[in-house]
């Protein structure tokens, strides 16, 4: 499989909710010994490869922002990200998202989704997607977020 980002750029007025989405495309290994681990973090546009830097999203690091798979227990502090305006969602079609509520210009940056395929006695397979969030200060609350493709946004796969 691979990870794609339906939109590579989100432009949101301050105060709106921004939902950033990644999508797993293609067949995902099934079976008791396979876990798909999905998480989110902030990064920067590195010279060699994007998504190499790991920065927290509203002080939550990548292990706090997991979409819990079949083997991964829900976080004991699972509701804490919600208290800080962060919500995780996923469906059975491979889509998964993070919603940032009431965005401010400080939320602007490069967001990365990371999908890891875990198989027993196998190395991790890592897949990345990235998208830019630009929050415009002082825009009216009536306007909504705009999502667009500024370039071909298929992610690079790194094992």
């Amino acid at each position: 499989f691979k990870v794609t980002t339906p939109y590579s750029l989100y432009v949101c007025p301050e105060g709106q909710n921004a939902t950033l989405t990644c999508r797993i495309l293609g067949p995902v290994s099934k079976g008791h010994d396979v876990t798909i681990y999905k998480t989110w973090y902030l990064s920067s546009r590195g010279e060699v490869q994007m998504c190499k830097e790991h920065r927290p999203i509203r002080n939550f690091t990548l292990q706090h922002l997991q979409h819990h798979g079949s083997h991964l227990k829900a976080n004991a502090s699972h509701d804490q990200p919600q208290k800080h305006g962060l919500e995780l969602a996923s469906d059975h079609h491979g889509n998964f998202s993070i919603t940032l509520r009431n965005v401010t210009p400080r939320d602007s940056g490069l967001y990365c989704c990371l999908v890891i395929e875990l198989k027993n006695h196998h190395p991790e397979q890592r897949f990345y997607g990235s998208m830019e969030l630009q929050v415009q200060a002082g825009k009216g609350s009536g306007s909504t977020c705009m999502a667009s493709n500024e370039q071909d946004s298929d992610s690079i796969t790194a094992a």
Epitope: Q49, K52, T61, H71, K73, S77
Partner: antibody, heavy 118, light 107 residues
Framework: QVQLQQSGAELMKPGASVKISCTAT????????IEWVKQRPGHGLEWLGE????????NYNEKFKDKATFTADTSSDTAYMQLSSLTSEDSAVYYC???????????WGAGTAVTVSS | DIVMTQSHKFMSTSVGDRVSITCKAS??????IAWYQQKPGQSPKLLIY???YRFTGVPDRFTGSGSGTDFTFTISSVQAEDLAVYYC?????????FGGGTKLDIK
């Protein structure tokens, strides 16, 4: 605050087995790998392998496959490493460390010294 | 297995000096390497990840660079508390392996 608390030093006889523990606090135990690393004086750091608690996924360094066995108990948030058929070559400090999937060894335990002597 | 080679086992430096430690991978590891600091009697601590990014709370005198097979760890102005052994480690594919370590002595 994320911490890994390791069990105390062990003095063992050759041929015996020892079980070292590593108790995690401050995060969801099942969300990160527990790594095991060996350090002998003058030998630097050697990776023995890893376990993902809750799933019991393991990856072993081939060199230590017949020496080390990893287990984890999610009810007590504790990972264990058993070393069997001990020899003087197994005398070392053993560290556990946490690794979020896809990332690096970001938190380390204080280490457990194992001495094998007759 | 990927072999990580730190060519200098020991380096001697003075407070205020700039010092660079090198690490060479036996095959291309992209930027999937980390640098750890181990002070005497302590466990290792993560300083640099993904070749060039400082871990949380790490002073900005510590920097990392490189990609592929050649990596450098630099302390721009050595402090007395930087006396330690520094290890590189790749995380490209298992087994993860460490360099042999470089012991930094302060004159």
């Amino acid at each position: 605050q994320v911490q890994l608390q390791q069990s105390g030093a062990e003095l063992m006889k050759p041929g015996a087995s020892v079980k070292i523990s590593c108790t995690a606090t401050g995060y969801t135990f099942s969300s990160c790998w527990i790594e095991w690393v060996k350090q002998r004086p003058g030998h630097g750091l050697e990776w023995l392998g890893e376990i993902l608690p809750g799933s019991d996924y393991t990856n072993y360094n081939e060199k230590f496959k017949d020496k080390a066995t990893f287990t984890a108990d999610t009810s007590s948030d504790t990972a264990y490493m058993q070393l069997s058929s001990l020899t003087s070559e197994d005398s070392a400090v053993y560290y556990c460390a946490r690794r979020p999937p896809g990332w690096y060894f970001d938190v380390w335990g204080a280490g457990t010294a194992v001495t094998v002597s007759s | 297995d990927i072999v990580m080679t730190q060519s200098h086992k020991f380096m001697s430096t003075s407070v205020g000096d700039r010092v660079s430690i090198t690490c060479k991978a036996s095959q291309d590891v992209s930027t999937d390497i980390a640098w750890y600091q181990q002070k005497p009697g302590q466990s290792p601590k993560l300083l640099i990840y993904s070749a060039s990014y400082r871990f949380t709370g790490v002073p900005d005198r510590f920097t990392g660079s490189g990609s592929g097979t050649d990596f450098t760890f630099t302390i721009s102005s050595v402090q007395a508390e930087d006396l330690a052994v520094y290890y590189c480690q790749h995380q490209y594919s298992t087994p993860w392996t460490f360099g042999g370590g470089t012991k930094l002595d302060i004159k």
